[in-house]
């Protein structure tokens, strides 16, 4: 079976205040079974940005329909970008577990930074 890879193609994403940013993430395998979550940062302060299963994320939408069985695209859009949104974003695969899911593999991260203001 093919080993799962987490692909975040952009190392750097320049965004504009007030606009919508798209953070890309695709996986190369449907296995292991379990969700893909989005985080900002690493370590103790790692912040949950999107979890399809629980929570309220009013500014985040998915690019694809995550409920489709064969979906391998876990990209997200973040609307109404502000300077507080800068940082490095990671899509992270969890393996289904009991009682809790276990982190399996992280993408390499995409750094979101502010680009030039629109003229």
């Amino acid at each position: 079976e093919e080993e799962l890879q987490m692909i975040q193609p952009e190392k750097l994403l320049l965004v504009t205040v007030g606009k919508t940013a798209t953070l890309h993430c695709t996986v190369t395998s449907l296995l292991p079974v379990g969700p893909v979550l989005w985080f900002r940062g690493v370590g103790p302060g790692r912040e949950l940005i999107y979890n399809q299963k629980e929570g309220h994320f009013p500014r985040v939408t998915t690019v694809s329909d995550l409920t489709k069985r064969n979906n391998m695209d876990f990209s997200i859009r973040i609307s109404s970008i502000t300077p507080a949104d800068v940082g490095t974003y990671y899509c992270v695969k969890f393996r289904k577990g009991s009682p809790e899911n276990v982190e399996f593999k992280s993408g390499p991260g995409t750094e979101m930074a502010l680009g030039a203001k629109p003229s």
Epitope: G43, P44, G45, R46, E47, L48, G55, V92
Partner: antibody, heavy 117, light 108 residues
Framework: DVQLVESGGGLVQPGGSLRLSCTAS????????MSWVRQAPGEGLEWVSA???????YYTDSVKGRFTISRDNSKNTLYLQMNSLRAEDTAIYYC???????????WGLGTLVTVSS | EIVLTQSPGTLSVSPGERVTLTCRAS??????IAWYQQKPGQAPRLLIY???SRATGIPGRFSGSGSGTEFTLTITSLQSEDFAVYYC??????????FGGGTKVEIK
């Protein structure tokens, strides 16, 4: 407004146990890293433990195996279970919210833990 | 573990003076330094992060600078409410997160 309120401190004998609580409000608790930072009387700040927004846990070496950090997202509460307490654990224990790049943007007022016979 | 050394340990100054506090790291930390103010009987308060970014609500007289291993916190025209202990913290390496020993700014 972000608010962090610690409780559970007190006087305990060496070798004893104590559980600290930190109740949070004003932000989406489950999404963020939370931490405990302590300050011995008249001394500086020392990071103790943290629980990230993904539920991962982190400890400074001196408390590993003795302290356990946990959280109940449904109650917006962070805990620190402290076992095998030592005199050198005597300190004010602060609960702090951790930013995504690992500094502390909000702090509680602290709760005093005294380990003495 | 990254060790942070703050100097001086105590600084005696008069209101209105300009104050510069130093924090040195035992290795390069890519500008990942935060500064906190703590008054007696109170919790620390975030002043500066990423070496030079002011936290929300912090007055403009507080500024941070530095790179590599040496960082400074400057308070221009010290106010009476600025007498406190100031701590630096590195947020580069989180295993573990570490603080400096603090600098006490007291009234001359």
């Amino acid at each position: 407004d972000v608010q962090l309120v610690e409780s559970g401190g007190g006087l305990v004998q060496p070798g004893g146990s104590l559980r600290l609580s930190c109740t949070a409000s004003g932000f989406t608790f489950r999404n963020y890293g939370m931490s405990w930072v302590r300050q011995a009387p008249g001394e500086g700040l020392e990071w103790v433990s943290a629980s990230s927004g993904s539920g991962s846990t982190y400890y400074t070496d001196s408390v590993k195996g003795r302290f356990t950090i946990s959280r109940d997202n449904s109650k917006n509460t962070l805990y620190l279970q402290m076992n095998s307490l030592r005199a050198e654990d005597t300190a004010i224990y602060y609960c702090a919210k951790v930013t995504w790049n690992n500094f502390f943007d909000y702090w509680g007022l602290g709760t005093l833990v005294t380990v003495s016979s | 573990e990254i060790v942070l050394t703050q100097s001086p340990g105590t600084l005696s100054v008069s209101p209105g003076e300009r104050v510069t506090l130093t924090c040195r790291a035992s290795q390069g930390i890519a500008g990942k330094i935060a500064w906190y103010q703590q008054k007696p009987g109170q919790a620390p308060r975030l002043l500066i992060y990423d070496a030079s970014s002011r936290a929300t609500g912090i007055p403009g007289r507080f500024s941070g600078s530095g790179s590599g291993t040496e960082f400074t916190l400057t308070i221009t025209s010290l106010q009476s409410e600025d007498f406190a202990v100031y701590y630096c913290q590195q947020h580069y390496d989180w295993s573990p997160l570490t603080f400096g020993g603090g600098t006490k700014v007291e009234i001359k």
